[in-house]
């Protein structure tokens, strides 16, 4: 009598996550009588995958009718495969008895599951930073298999090199995750800049997945302040201008102080954007010179994006003969102008 053979023709089978996998198994003889069972893994810790006689295996169906007389095909189909199904599957013949005795195992079929990486998620720094500072962006993608993957970072189309990338776990696993950190040095021109994390994997049909982050979320461009006085008007009123330029984000509060006392507070809103994404804002203050006996110290105080206030001061000269000041120019009035940033 020829010895019974359990034939698993495929050494390995690859399937895409979500698909079905067919694991083939035939036996060379109907003798001896006894059931066939499918296991994942070998040894004492093996996991029962399918047993015709008993148990509930909702995702596993026999390929041919196992109750059919003289059936020698014990192939199974596993539906809706996930990376967790990866492993080596054994078709095992038992001799009928009490209990049944394991007689022979097939050589095993290794099931590998190919799974696409999730869309990369890019996160930036929790707090804004100013130009010349370095900020870190993190990119994460999960659930892919096999492990081989490439990740590249770009800023405005140029590949970044200050990058650290890890694929976990290091050993064999059903699926993998990638996490990468890119360090970017900010410039004042980066309001409209973008960083892109690009992930390429064998399962993607030639097109990398991309995650993006806008540097506008990470950058703060502090304003430049300039306080100037226009020519004195005939009615003894002086127009003083505070120009706040090249700032981002728009969140800005401007306060005028006359001799240290708050005169007016304004909030920036609905400002037109500069080409580079920054904003400009101009505020005017009319000072009635005839109402003052002494020089007036005007301060333009700007609080930008929750940062400590920045001041720029300007002294308006009050003369003993105010009427003669009508022709004075701004330059002639700069005597003791204070232009310090406090």
């Amino acid at each position: 009598e020829e010895e019974l053979q359990v034939i698993q023709p495929e050494k390995s089978v690859s399937v895409a996550a979500g698909d079905s996998a067919t694991l083939n198994c035939t036996v060379s003889s109907l003798i001896p009588v006894g059931p066939i069972q499918w296991f994942r893994g070998a040894g004492p810790g093996r996991e029962l995958i399918y047993n015709l006689k008993e148990g509930h295996f909702p995702r596993v169906t026999p390929v041919s009718d196992p109750t059919k007389r003289n059936n020698m095909d014990f192939s199974i189909r596993i539906s809706n495969i996930t990376p967790a199904d990866a492993g080596t599957y054994y078709c095992v013949k038992f001799r009928k008895g009490s209990p049944d005795v394991e007689l022979k195992s097939g050589a095993g079929t290794e099931l590998s599951v190919r799974a696409k990486p999730s869309a990369p998620v890019v996160s930036g720094p929790a707090v804004r930073a100013t130009a010349e500072h370095t900020v870190s962006f993190t990119c994460e993608s999960h659930g892919f298999s096999p492990r081989d993957i490439t990740l590249k970072w770009f800023k405005n189309g140029n590949e970044l090199s200050d990058v650290q990338t890890n694929v976990d776990p290091a050993g064999k696993s059903v699926s993998y995750s990638i996490r990468s950190t890119a360090r970017v040095v900010l410039t004042r021109r980066d309001v409209h800049s973008q960083v892109i994390c690009e992930v390429a994997h064998v399962t993607l049909q030639g097109d990398p997945l991309r995650g993006t982050a806008n540097l506008s979320e990470a950058i703060r461009v502090p304003p430049f302040l300039e306080v100037t006085q226009q020519s004195m008007r005939a009615d003894n009123q002086v127009n003083v201008t505070c120009q706040v330029t090249k700032f981002y984000p728009q969140r800005l509060q401007l306060t005028w102080l006359e001799n240290g006392n708050v005169s007016r507070t304004e909030m920036a809103s609905a400002l037109p954007e500069n080409k580079d994404g920054t904003y400009n804002w101009t505020s005017w203050l009319l000072v009635n010179v005839s109402a003052h006996r002494d020089d007036v110290k005007l301060t333009c105080q700007v609080e930008h994006d929750g940062q400590p206030a920045v001041n720029k001061s300007f002294s308006v000269k009050v003369s003993a003969h105010p009427k003669e000041q009508g022709s004075n120019t701004a330059a002639e009035n700069t005597g003791t102008n204070e232009r310090n940033i406090y």
């Epitope: 081989d148 993957i149 993607l204 049909q205 097109d207």
Partner: antibody, heavy 117, light 109 residues
Framework: KVEESGGGLVQPGGSLRLSCAAS????????MGWVRQAPGKGLEWVSI???????YYASWVNGRFTISKDNSEGMVYLQMNSLRAEDTAVYYC?????????????WGQGTTVTVSS | DIVMTQSPDSLAVSLGERATINCQAG??????LAWYQQKPGQPPKLLIY???TLESGVPDRFSGSGSGTDFTLTISSLQAEDVAVYYC???????????FGGGTKLEIK
């Protein structure tokens, strides 16, 4: 299936445009490629185009060839310029596998390109 | 570019005997290796991908093994219809480029 056309005899320095008609699947879901085989020689990868239309080329192509596609028509093209005698070959259009881009599982019968004066 | 070296260039094996063809990659390609069979006047036919996965409809006398840089195609019991040229093909996941081996001509002894 895939089917190539457009091959023929061309003089050195000339141009030729090969076409590949794909049926039974959507070009927007698969990478398509061109592989060539010189007479009596082995297979040589030429180019692929991604599902979204990004082109990739073998390093020796040096800008002489351009791959493109029309998803709605189900066509893939290989524009070959500045042809040389060594470009004489059977050019196969092939589709990568459904599980990944690492293998070609559907091949056309090929179209013959002869570069000679 | 990755260079794929196939050996031997030609091979003669008796019917029913085992045939073994080797393929070596110039650098690691992990398991991204495919094997093709090409008969005269026909396009290549995919046999095996991902080093050891048998393509649907391919007889199970064909098997593949290996990873990294060294790979093997085995025909366990040669049949007359297996006479053909066999090619290995790599895909490099970093450069995203392909390369073919030079081919092995398999004949019956």
């Amino acid at each position: 299936k895939v089917e190539e056309s457009g091959g023929g005899l061309v003089q050195p320095g000339g141009s030729l445009r090969l076409s590949c008609a794909a049926s039974g699947f959507s070009l927007s879901s698969y990478v398509m490629g061109w592989v060539r085989q010189a007479p009596g020689k082995g297979l040589e990868w030429v180019s692929i185009i991604s599902s979204s239309g990004s082109p990739y080329y073998a390093s020796w192509v040096n800008g002489r060839f351009t791959i493109s596609k029309d998803n709605s028509e189900g066509m893939v093209y290989l524009q070959m310029n500045s042809l040389r005698a060594e470009d004489t070959a059977v050019y196969y259009c092939a589709r990568v596998g459904p599980l990944g881009v690492d293998y070609f599982n559907i091949w056309g019968q090929g179209t013959t390109v002869t570069v000679s004066s | 570019d990755i260079v794929m070296t196939q050996s031997p260039d030609s091979l003669a094996v008796s019917l029913g005997e085992r045939a073994t063809i080797n393929c070596q990659a110039g650098q690691s390609i992990n398991s991204y290796l495919a094997w093709y069979q090409q008969k005269p006047g026909q396009p290549p036919k995919l046999l095996i991908y991902y080093a050891s996965t048998l393509e649907s409809g391919v007889p199970d006398r064909f098997s593949g093994s290996g990873s990294g840089t060294d790979f093997t195609l085995t025909i366990s019991s040669l049949q007359a219809e297996d006479v053909a040229v066999y090619y290995c093909q790599s895909w490099h996941y970093i450069s995203r480029s392909y390369a073919f081996g030079g081919g092995t001509k398999l004949e019956i002894k």
